[in-house]
Interface confidence: low
């Protein structure tokens, strides 16, 4: 039985504080009382806590604990969210500028083929861009297409300019001639090369930083148990109760309540630093074919090797696809 | 080589990009969040630290609070006391994570995975076969000028030289965080949190 | 110093012919874009017409297509604008301009116009 | 023919902030600004939606966002009083100006 309170002890600094943590509930005592009900601050003496009080002691804790870890980790949150827009807006930037810059290849070197051209580049490089937002494509088909939609273009305007506008017939067998015929030579290989080891770099990179947002997240709104809100109550709420305001925890105290707290949260450690580290990898490899922005601005100028490389072999090539689409082509005249 | 027709004003050796040396590329850009995200790397290891730091806690007072009752601030009650007769501590500790923490970790461990193996040297045979195809020089290894693959010895050096930055309306200096200037920190309003 | 001059404006009836000229020095002439750009009295700018640096490219305003004709001499440093059937519209400032190119050397389409002539005026009144 | 348009007039006091709208650019282009001062050339200003050439004031600013640009204006001085273009590029990459804004410093 714990010694009676001094006659003229009251509540009322108690009372004062509680007020502001739940203003204009009666729960506070006006004396202290033995407190035979406290089942988290148990009482060594009269206490000026009631059930109830205790109940709200533990829920402001555990809030205060929710939001000592957002603002632990605000500045981490900011950098990787800011970072992520960032490098989505300048991913889809380089996009656009590798976009107009082959645009203006065209039309500053083969001003015949542009209407098209620019119709053909601006869905590979659309392309391009969903890629890299994760879009289920795959680049070796986008650079196909690429190159499957400019030859009939090529043919008939560059290489075959007495022809009548082209017919699908015509198109058909020029599309299946470029590839069969390799007219572009190695180009499109190494593009397909450059262009999906880039992207796939850049694809990665996006999602990590995508990932690393959810980590902090989820680690950000962890609700806490039970448990440890009665820890939490204990060592920031329980002196209150005797009437010890100005009291503060012992620092080696609050660590051993943190740690029991963030048990969970923190064998996410080993992993995090591994990201971090892996991530780090990752960018010191970005560079020359695993560099998007290096890649997609120079597209421009290898495609324009490419279309020199087929008007290299115009010849040739206008003699082998006479024969090979001399059917379509006769379909066509008639 | 391939020949470039005059109005690409191409530079046979060095395509010459008039751009300043300290505008931040793309490539630089990545490296500064590397270096700022390492000094986060024991971020989970340290929660529990930064937290305390973060709330009151008796720092140069004489007597402290351990759970139970007031006591020296360098006594061994300090720390032990107040986790007598209490629940088991190691017992929330055997917990184990939450199922939201347990699900996130299978995540880091799978970008982890394929980070690695998007690093890996081993998945970087390309550069040789490229070079065996006559596409790529080997004389591009500088920091700052990189490669692109022209055609067999036309090889053309181009600077990294989006100058991204200067299109996006961010600005990434932690100092302006907003977390900087948060209001309802437990620091910035501890009457509604800690009386101190 | 970087520098553009035309010459060549007047008066002149509709229906007539003008040549403009624009010399330039103080940059590679060869290696840029030039573009002509007007401005009728009291209005805005218009662009009118722009040639690649070899000269093989040509491009013009609707409203000059078929009548102007832009070309230039890289070994003179200078750029043209042979300007035929005029009309009382075309009365104007006629500015030559250099393409501004920061990146890409080549890139002289989208950049803007770093360098401008002080302008030649164009008249076409009966 | 794409059409950039721009407010006619613009003011604001010495020493205020101003900005200058430009809307309808929508090929992808980047927008340039030109500062026109009486009776003289246009003069390139920001290009590339909000880089200055060397010599232009930090006072003046550029910047982008979707289908308009805007030129932010810090400090005003008389010496700023002028017509002010925003350009940009049509689909077939041929130049194309806004209407003009006269900005007065009152």
């Known amino acids: 039985q714990p010694p009676p309170p001094p006659p003229d002890a009251t509540c009322h600094q108690v009372r004062s504080f509680f007020q502001r943590l739940q203003p204009g509930l009666k729960w506070v005592p006006e004396t202290p009382v033995p407190g035979s009900d406290l089942q988290v601050c148990l009482p060594k003496g009269p206490t000026c806590c009631s059930r109830k009080m205790e109940e709200k002691y533990q829920l402001t804790a555990r809030l205060n604990m929710e939001q000592l870890l957002q603002s632990a980790s605000m500045e981490l949150k900011f950098l990787i969210i800011q970072n992520a827009a960032v490098f989505q807006e300048a991913f889809e930037i380089v996009v656009r500028h590798a976009k107009n810059y082959t645009n203006a290849m065209f039309k500053n070197n083969y001003p015949s083929l542009t209407p098209q051209a620019f119709e053909f580049v601006g869905e590979f490089f659309t392309d391009v861009s969903l890629y890299i937002l994760g879009s289920d494509i795959n680049v070796d088909d986008m650079v196909n297409e690429l190159f499957d939609s400019l030859f009939p273009v090529i043919y008939t305007q560059l290489m075959n300019p007495g022809l009548p506008d082209s017919a699908l017939d015509i198109n058909e067998c020029l599309r299946g001639a470029r590839r069969d015929l390799k007219v572009f030579g190695n180009f499109p290989k190494l593009i397909m090369t450059q262009v999906s080891k880039s992207l796939q770099v850049t694809r990665i990179f996006l999602q990590a930083l995508n990932l690393g947002i959810e980590v902090i997240n989820t680690t950000d709104h962890l609700k806490f148990s039970k448990d440890c809100g009665r820890m939490l109550t204990r060592m920031w709420y329980c002196s209150y109760c005797q009437g010890l305001m100005m009291v503060k925890p012992c620092g080696g105290y609050c660590n051993v309540v943190m740690q029991g707290c963030m048990a969970g949260v923190v064998e996410i450690d080993k992993y995090w630093r591994e990201y971090i580290l892996s991530l780090e990898e990752l960018v010191n490899g970005m560079y020359r074919i695993y560099d998007m922005e290096n890649v997609l601005l120079g597209l421009f100028s290898t495609i324009h090797d490419s279309i020199q490389y087929v008007q290299k072999n115009a010849g040739k090539l206008t003699t082998t696809i006479g024969k090979l689409c001399a059917h379509s082509q006769q379909r066509q005249y008639r | 080589s391939a020949y470039y027709p005059e109005d690409l004003f191409i530079d046979k050796k060095v395509l010459k990009v008039a751009h300043v040396e300290h505008e931040e590329t793309l490539s630089s850009r990545r490296r500064e969040l590397i270096q700022k995200l390492k000094s986060f790397i024991s971020f989970y290891s340290a929660l529990p630290g930064y937290i305390c730091s973060h709330s009151p806690v008796a720092e140069n007072d004489t007597l402290c609070w351990n759970g139970q009752e007031l006591v020296e601030r360098y006594s061994q009650k300090a720390a032990r006391n107040g986790m007598k007769n209490q629940f088991n501590l190691h017992e929330l500790k055997m917990k184990g994570p939450e199922p939201v923490v347990s699900q996130i970790i299978d995540k880091l461990k799978h970008i982890n995975q394929l980070l690695r193996t998007m690093s890996m040297p081993k998945g970087r045979v390309l550069d040789k076969n490229l070079d065996e195809e006559g596409f790529e020089s080997g004389d591009c290894g500088d920091d700052e000028d990189e490669c692109i693959g022209g055609s067999g010895d036309g090889m053309i050096k181009v600077k990294n030289q989006l100058r991204f930055l200067a299109e996006l309306a961010y600005d990434l200096d932690v100092d302006d965080a907003p977390g900087n200037s948060q209001q309802a920190t437990p620091k910035d309003n501890e009457i509604s949190t800690f009386h101190n | 110093e970087v520098q553009l001059v035309e010459s060549g404006g007047g008066l002149v009836q509709p229906g007539g012919s003008l040549r403009l000229s624009c010399a330039a020095s103080?940059?590679?002439?060869?290696?840029?874009?030039m573009s002509w750009v007007r401005q009728a009295p009291g209005k805005g700018l218009e662009w009118v017409s722009s040639?690649?640096?070899?000269?093989?490219?040509?491009y013009y305003a609707d409203s000059v297509k078929g009548r102007f004709t832009i070309s230039r001499d890289n070994s003179k440093n200078t750029l043209y604008l042979q300007m035929n059937s005029l009309r009382a519209e075309d009365t104007a400032v006629y500015y030559c301009?250099?393409?501004?190119?920061?990146?890409?050397?080549?890139?002289?389409?989208?950049?803007?116009?770093?360098?401008w002539g002080q302008g030649t005026t164009v008249t076409v009144s009966s | 023919q794409s059409v950039l348009t721009q407010p006619p007039s613009v003011s604001g006091a010495p020493g205020q902030r101003v900005t200058i709208s430009c809307t309808g650019s929508?090929?992808?282009?980047?927008v340039h600004w030109y500062q026109q001062l009486p009776g003289r050339a246009p003069k390139l200003l920001i290009y590339?939606?909000?880089n200055r050439p060397s010599g232009v004031p930090d006072r003046f600013s550029g910047s982008n966002s979707g289908t308009s640009a805007s030129l932010a204006i810090t400090g005003l001085q008389a010496e700023d009083e002028a017509d002010y273009y925003c350009?940009?590029?049509?689909?077939?990459?041929?130049?194309?100006f806004g209407g003009g804004t006269k900005l007065t410093v009152l």
């Open positions: 301009a250099k393409e501004y190119d920061y990146g890409l050397g080549w890139m002289h389409y989208y950049y803007g116009m770093d360098v």
């Open positions: 103080g940059f590679t002439f060869k290696r840029y874009a």
């Open positions: 040639v690649s640096s070899s000269g093989t490219g040509t």
């Open positions: 929508s090929s992808g282009y980047d």
């Open positions: 590339g939606s909000n």
């Open positions: 350009q940009s590029y049509d689909s077939s990459l041929n130049a194309i």
